[in-house]
Interface confidence: low
């Protein structure tokens, strides 16, 4: 069988949800000594990066300027050491946001509930769409989907204190083109034991863990560095 290198890891820097016309940055983490990295979009070659010096860097960044719906979709990457190519990375879904309208998110019976109560989020959007998405801040990979015309509902069932936090919703014009995010709605859940509303943690939205972590080898030590870790605005 043909020998291949281990598959690289593909990540989005800052977030996989990129506002239209902004720059997206994808990181492909392969191995030291890789002389070439290729970014593939929907199965076709999209961009090539050659790290310098290859023996000191274990990955590259691909900058995708002027994000739009034509650039949103499934990305993967591969790398080459000498003549040997790696396996293909897992697929990364890159989404363009801030398309068209802004939805309105509401929660019933209200934003302050007791543990065990049934809660439903409602996401309303004027523009024609069939799919709505609900995201909890800090957990943007855990996307809940619901279907409706102008409004969709997200029944949460009986909530616990684990549900507390800030939520936003999007309308989706296709799997990779989303609306502007709604204003956040903070869900406050009073616990069974404690009798006060627990303020939600409010991390920045989207997730902070999505940042690209690439390793640069400096001399004998490997220095874990955040490369250009600030979000592209």
């Amino acid at each position: 069988p043909k020998q291949t290198l281990p598959k690289p890891i593909i990540r989005a820097e800052s977030t996989y949800m990129v506002p239209k016309e902004k720059q997206a940055t994808l990181c492909c983490q392969g191995s030291y000594g890789a002389v070439e990295y290729q970014l593939h979009f929907e199965g076709s070659l999209f961009a090539v990066e050659r790290p310098k010096p290859p023996e000191r860097i274990n990955g590259v960044k691909f900058h995708i300027p002027d994000m739009n719906s034509r650039k949103a979709g499934r990305y993967s990457c591969i790398y080459r050491v000498g003549e040997l190519w790696s396996e293909r990375s897992d697929l990364l879904d890159l989404v363009v946001t801030e398309m068209y309208d802004t939805p309105t998110l509401s929660v019933h019976p209200g934003p302050e509930v007791t543990s065990g109560e049934k809660v439903t989020f409602y996401c309303r959007l004027d523009t024609a769409t069939s799919m709505f998405l609900l995201l909890k801040e800090g957990r943007s990979r855990d996307v809940q989907r619901s279907y409706g015309k102008v409004q969709a509902e997200f029944p949460m069932g009986p909530v616990t204190t684990a549900h507390r936090g800030s939520y936003r919703c999007f309308g989706s014009y296709n799997n990779y083109a989303w609306s502007f995010p709604s204003e956040p709605v903070k869900l406050l859940v009073t616990g069974d034991i404690e009798n006060t509303s627990l303020a939600p943690t409010d991390p920045t939205f989207p997730d902070s863990w999505d940042t690209c972590l690439l390793t640069r080898e400096t001399g004998l030590q490997k220095d874990l560095a955040l490369w250009d870790h600030t979000a592209q605005n």
Epitope: Y100, T102, D126, A128, V150, F180, S182
Partner: antibody, heavy 116, light 107 residues
């Protein structure tokens, strides 16, 4: 009841700008997008663009992009449409319309006349 | 962009008769089609939303049908106040577009 009240008629010179206002009442302003539609004398309806007062997100008809600027002031529940580099063919009645999927409520219209 | 075409441009009908107005979209818009009535010197008024959904305060003689690309507005028995211009509108995708209008006049 829902009401959209627009500013009064304007007479402008070619090359100048006009800013039309639309004050909303009777509903939560930030929950609906506000759109602008114009109608030239004896002609049909033409969509200019829309704005989400929630966070200011806009969408424009490509024909007006760069010339039309839509803004909204949540504190006064007022939407604005500014059109620059006016020419005679911009003479029309300009309407604001609340969009709840369809344009369910309309302002009374503002006549803009462009003449030298 | 989605082009909306209305027919006929002018329709002459007698009061009490039935009027049928047509609207065609250049591509499928599902049922995201809205109808408006406009009288001289007035703003348009919403009659039907989502192809067939009635609007509170609009007389029951107004009804809509269709899906995809072909839509119809029917006025079952014309009243004198129904003579006006009628517009259909694509509510499916931007840019939002209107038909050129059908003028309903008294025969």
């Amino acid at each position: 009841q829902v009401q959209l009240v627009q500013s009064g008629a304007e007479v402008k010179k070619p090359g100048s700008s006009v800013k039309v206002s639309c004050k909303a009442s009777g509903y939560t302003f930030s929950e609906y997008t506000m759109h602008w539609v114009r109608q030239a004398p004896g002609q049909g309806l033409e969509w200019i663009g829309g704005i989400s007062p929630n966070i200011g997100g806009t969408s424009y008809n490509q024909k007006f992009k760069g010339r039309a600027t839509l803004t909204a002031d949540k504190s006064t529940s007022t939407a604005y449409m500014e059109l620059s580099s006016l020419r005679s063919e911009d003479t029309a009645v300009y309407y604001c319309a609340r969009r709840g999927g369809s344009f369910d409520y309309w302002g009374q219209g503002t006549t803009v006349t462009v003449s030298s | 962009e989605i082009v909306m075409t209305q027919s006929p441009a002018t329709l002459s009908v007698s009061p009490g008769e039935r009027a049928t107005l047509s609207c065609r979209a250049s591509q499928s818009i599902s049922d995201y089609l809205h109808w408006y009535q406009q009288k001289p010197g007035q703003a348009p008024r919403l009659l039907i939303k989502y192809a067939s959904q009635s609007i509170s305060g609009i007389p029951a003689r107004f009804s809509g049908s269709g899906s995809g690309t072909d839509f119809t507005l029917t006025i079952s028995s014309l009243e004198p106040e129904d003579f006006a211009v009628y517009y259909c509108q694509n509510g499916h995708s931007f840019p939002l577009t209107f038909g050129q209008g059908t003028k309903l006049e008294i025969k």
